[in-house]
C-alpha cells in the first residue's frame, strides 16, 4: 500500500513527457468494454457524438475504436531512468477525425473532431492493472483516469494505489 504518494510517484512528470515521433508505433482496432462486460458505444446525435456504456443485445455488433499507440519518453531528471523511462500513450478514435478527449474542467470524456497534431487532451497513458484489462490515464492530469459513472464515461481521480484496481477504471479490449 503506497497511499496517495504512490499514485503520484507512478504518474509524476506526465505533463512534461514528450511523445517520440509524430507517428504511432502501432494501431489496433478493438471494441472497448468495461470490466463488467458492458460495451462502450458511440451514437451520432444532433451532429455530435455521445458516448454510452450499455449492455448490448445478443448478436448486436460492438462499436470499434482505433487505438493508436505512441511512445513517450520521461525526462531523465524526473524518472531517474535516464532514457529508459518509456511509457505508452494512446489515442482513441471511434470514427474518422473524431477522438476521445479529456475535459478536465467538467470531469468528462468527450468526442471532438480535430486535426493532427492532436492536443494533449486526446492522449492517455496506457496502464495494465490486470493481464486482460487496461486503464487510461489523462496525459494532462496525472492520477485521473477514464472511468464509468452513471452509465457514461467520466474522469475519475484515483487517490491511492489500492484504487488503481477499482473496476470502474478497468476496460477490456477485444478484436471481436
Amino acid at each position: 500500500a503506497f497511499g496517495i504518494s504512490g499514485v503520484q510517484k507512478y504518474t509524476r512528470a506526465l505533463h512534461d513527457s514528450s511523445i517520440t515521433g509524430i507517428s504511432p508505433i502501432t494501431e489496433y482496432l478493438a471494441s472497448l468494454s468495461t470490466y463488467n462486460d458492458q460495451s462502450i458505444t458511440f451514437a451520432l446525435e444532433d451532429e455530435s457524438y455521445e458516448i454510452y456504456v450499455e449492455d448490448l443485445k445478443k448478436d448486436e455488433k460492438k462499436d470499434k475504436v482505433l487505438l493508436s499507440y505512441y511512445e513517450s519518453q520521461h525526462p531523465s531528471n524526473e524518472s531517474g531512468d535516464g532514457v529508459d523511462g518509456k511509457m505508452l500513450m494512446v489515442t482513441l478514435s471511434p470514427t474518422k477525425d473524431f477522438w476521445l478527449h479529456a475535459n478536465n474542467k467538467e470531469h468528462s470524456v468527450e468526442l471532438h473532431k480535430c486535426e493532427k497534431p492532436l492536443p494533449d487532451q486526446a492522449f492517455f497513458v496506457l496502464h495494465n492493472m490486470h493481464s486482460n484489462c487496461v486503464s487510461f490515464e489523462c496525459k494532462t492530469d496525472p492520477g485521473v483516469f477514464i472511468g464509468v459513472k452513471d452509465n457514461h464515461l467520466a474522469l475519475i481521480k484515483v487517490d491511492s494505489s489500492e484504487n488503481l484496481c477499482t473496476e470502474n477504471i478497468l476496460f477490456k479490449l477485444s478484436e471481436t
Partner: antibody
C-alpha cells in the same frame, strides 16, 4: 544502467523448495511489470510468472500454477520467486526480466538478468 | 493458449546472406510480438518489439514484419556475430508463449 541480478539457485531434491531473488537497479522499479522466464538445458524459453507494477496481480502458466509464487518488494527493489513441490522438469536457468514500458506489458522484455540455475534431482 | 510455431528450426547460411525466420501463431492477435537473439551461455537479447520496431542499439540489418498470425524476422546481410538462436514471443494474451527457436549456423 539497468541491472537485474538473480540469486538463490542451486541443487534441490524433488518435492523440495527454493526461493529465487532478483535485485534490480538503475530504473524506477515500482513502475514496471516484472516477469520470470526459464530455459531448460538445451531447450527453448518458457514464461514462468508475471507480476503487475502495483503488485496487485500475479499470473502463471498451468505448469507452475499452485506451486510457484511471484512477489515483489518495492522498498528493496527486489523480485522473488518462491518455488515449492519442485519436479525434475523444473530444472532450468531462471531469468528475471523487466517490461519495456512503465505500467504495462506491451513490447517484450528488453532487460534480462544473467540467470540462475535450478537443478532438481535426487 | 496461443501456440507460436517457428520455422525453420535451424538453418545454415553464409556471411552476407539474407536470412528470413518466420513465426506462425495458432490464432490472430494484436502485434505484441517480439524477437530475441540468444548466444550460448548468454541471456536473450531483445531485437524487435511491436512486430516491427527495432530495439535501441540493435543494428538496422535486423527487421521485423507481419500481423495477425504471420510474423517474420529478416537479417538483410548476415554478419559473423549474428550466428545464434532466435526466438519469437507473443505478449498479447496470457499465457505468454515463445516460439521453439531457430538456430542460425555457419554454412
Amino acid at each position: 544502467e539497468v541491472q537485474l541480478v538473480e540469486s538463490g539457485g542451486g541443487l534441490v531434491q524433488p518435492g523440495g523448495s527454493l526461493r529465487l531473488s532478483c535485485a534490480a537497479s538503475g530504473f524506477t522499479f515500482n513502475n514496471y511489470w516484472m516477469t520470470w522466464v526459464r530455459q531448460a538445458p538445451g531447450k527453448g524459453l518458457e514464461w514462468v510468472a508475471s507480476i503487475t507494477y502495483t503488485g496487485g496481480g500475479t499470473y502463471y502458466p498451468d505448469s507452475v500454477k499452485g506451486r510457484f509464487t511471484i512477489s515483489r518488494d518495492d522498498a528493496k527493489n527486489s523480485l522473488y520467486l518462491q518455488m515449492n513441490s519442485l519436479r525434475a522438469e523444473d530444472t532450468a536457468v531462471y531469468y528475471c526480466t523487466r517490461a519495456n514500458y512503465y505500467y504495462n506489458t506491451y513490447g517484450g522484455f528488453p532487460y534480462w538478468g544473467q540467470g540462475t540455475l535450478v537443478t532438481v534431482s535426487s | 493458449d496461443i501456440q507460436m510455431t517457428q520455422s525453420p528450426s535451424s538453418l545454415s547460411a553464409s556471411v552476407g546472406d539474407r536470412v528470413t525466420i518466420t513465426c506462425l501463431a495458432s490464432e490472430g492477435f494484436s502485434n505484441d510480438l517480439a524477437w530475441y537473439q540468444q548466444k550460448p551461455g548468454k541471456s536473450p537479447k531483445l531485437l524487435i518489439y511491436a512486430a516491427s520496431r527495432l530495439q535501441d542499439g540493435v543494428p538496422s540489418r535486423f527487421s521485423g514484419s507481419g500481423s495477425g498470425t504471420d510474423f517474420t524476422l529478416t537479417i538483410s546481410s548476415l554478419q559473423p556475430e549474428d550466428f545464434a538462436t532466435y526466438f519469437c514471443q507473443q505478449g498479447s494474451k496470457y499465457p505468454l508463449t515463445f516460439g521453439g527457436g531457430t538456430k542460425v549456423e555457419i554454412k
